[in-house]
Amino acid sequence: EKAMVDGSWLDLAKRSKLEAQPFAHLTINATDIPSGSHKVSLSSWYHDRGWAKISNMTFSNGKLIVNQDGFYYLYANICFRHHETSGDLATEYLQLMVYVTKTSIKIPSSHTLMKGGSTKYWSGNSEFHFYSINVGGFFKLRSGEEISIEVSNPSLLDPDQDATYFGAFKVRDID
């Protein structure tokens, strides 16, 4: 009986620890995509609707803020698209990029953790163009550090929640 109580207590402890594990999955807010033809910061994301969720992390001023030290897996998926019904591309040669950036408040500094993308030739003869970028990596993050996303050509972003999103989850503590 004691073993059973110990076992269930262990399960509970494991479960509560898992529930406390920080994670976030943020999806693009399509009503507030910034304009620009160069690199811009994407600051408007959903954290509590559709597929978007957040726990033990904070989303503020367009940045995902780490609340617990640890090793985290960070990921971002960005889709670019253009359909001729919205008009023509002013240039057919495009640099479609995403940058995942870490900003530290304590020691004011900013680092690009991951970048991905390509230069593309989107011919005016085609009705539809699509390009997807996925980046992911394992990083040591400290409490108070902020993660943000920058992209090129935001007017071409695919605004669907299954297309443009980023997130993080804690994998383990820092020893």
Partner: antibody
């Protein structure tokens, strides 16, 4: 205020060429595209082509491909449309129009014509 | 290639009347539709863009609605200065025009 001022009326013989100018003022010429649209007597408006005033990129209607040239002089904030091998059915009022999309804000030419020139009548007659 | 079809091709109405012009696209164009006013000897004027957004400086009696393939331009109370030909447009394609006259 934004203004597009076009050159005056022209009369040409069949087979000749015509070049119409469109001088822009009141905005940063290089940040927008200029479209050319025409209207023949009793006909609907007809899109001919555009030029991105910033980089000089152009796109034309299939109907005019090979006969039309659109250029721009950024120093003079002026766009030009030349139509060659004129025929009587090219008799029309030719308009330049500014695209609403600012190239600093994005890279899509949206085909919202927010400002128009006053039109240039081109008559092709033998 | 998308074809835009307007109806009616002409109409006659009294001052103060509500006037409706319809525009159909040969396939879905979402909300990428604009309306223009043309008066003889004058530069064309953008009235409505993106199906329902009123261009600045345009009187509020003009309104646009619709999405997909069917759109309407409404003049809530026709004024003498509204005598003109009205065109719908999606990117490179224009409708054939609707001539509005006063009875």
């Amino acid at each position: 205020q934004v203004q597009l001022v076009q050159s005056g009326a022209e009369v040409r013989k069949p087979g000749a060429s015509v070049k119409v100018s469109c001088k822009a003022s009141g905005y940063d010429f290089s940040n927008y595209a200029i479209h050319w649209v025409r209207q023949a007597p009793g006909q609907r408006l007809e899109w001919m082509g555009w030029i991105n005033a910033g980089n000089g990129n152009t796109k034309f209607s299939q109907k005019f491909q090979g006969r039309i040239t659109v250029t721009r002089d950024t120093a003079a904030s002026t766009a030009y449309m030349e139509l060659r091998s004129l025929r009587s059915e090219d008799t029309a009022v030719y308009y330049c129009a500014r695209d609403w999309s600012n190239m600093v804000r994005g890279i899509i030419i949206a085909y919202y014509f927010d400002y128009w020139g006053q039109g240039t009548l081109v008559t092709v007659s033998s | 290639e998308i074809v835009m079809t307007q109806s009616p091709s002409s109409l006659s109405a009294s001052v103060g009347d509500r006037v409706t012009i319809t525009c159909r696209a040969s396939q879905s164009i979402s909300r990428y539709l604009n309306w223009y006013q043309l008066k003889p000897g004058k530069a064309p004027r953008l009235l409505i863009y993106g199906a329902s957004s009123l261009q600045s400086g345009v009187p509020s009696r003009f309104s646009g609605s619709g999405s997909g393939a069917e759109f309407t331009l409404t003049i809530s109370s026709l004024q003498p200065e509204d005598i003109a030909t009205y065109y719908c447009q999606h990117t490179r394609a224009f409708g054939q025009g609707t001539k509005v006259e006063i009875k």
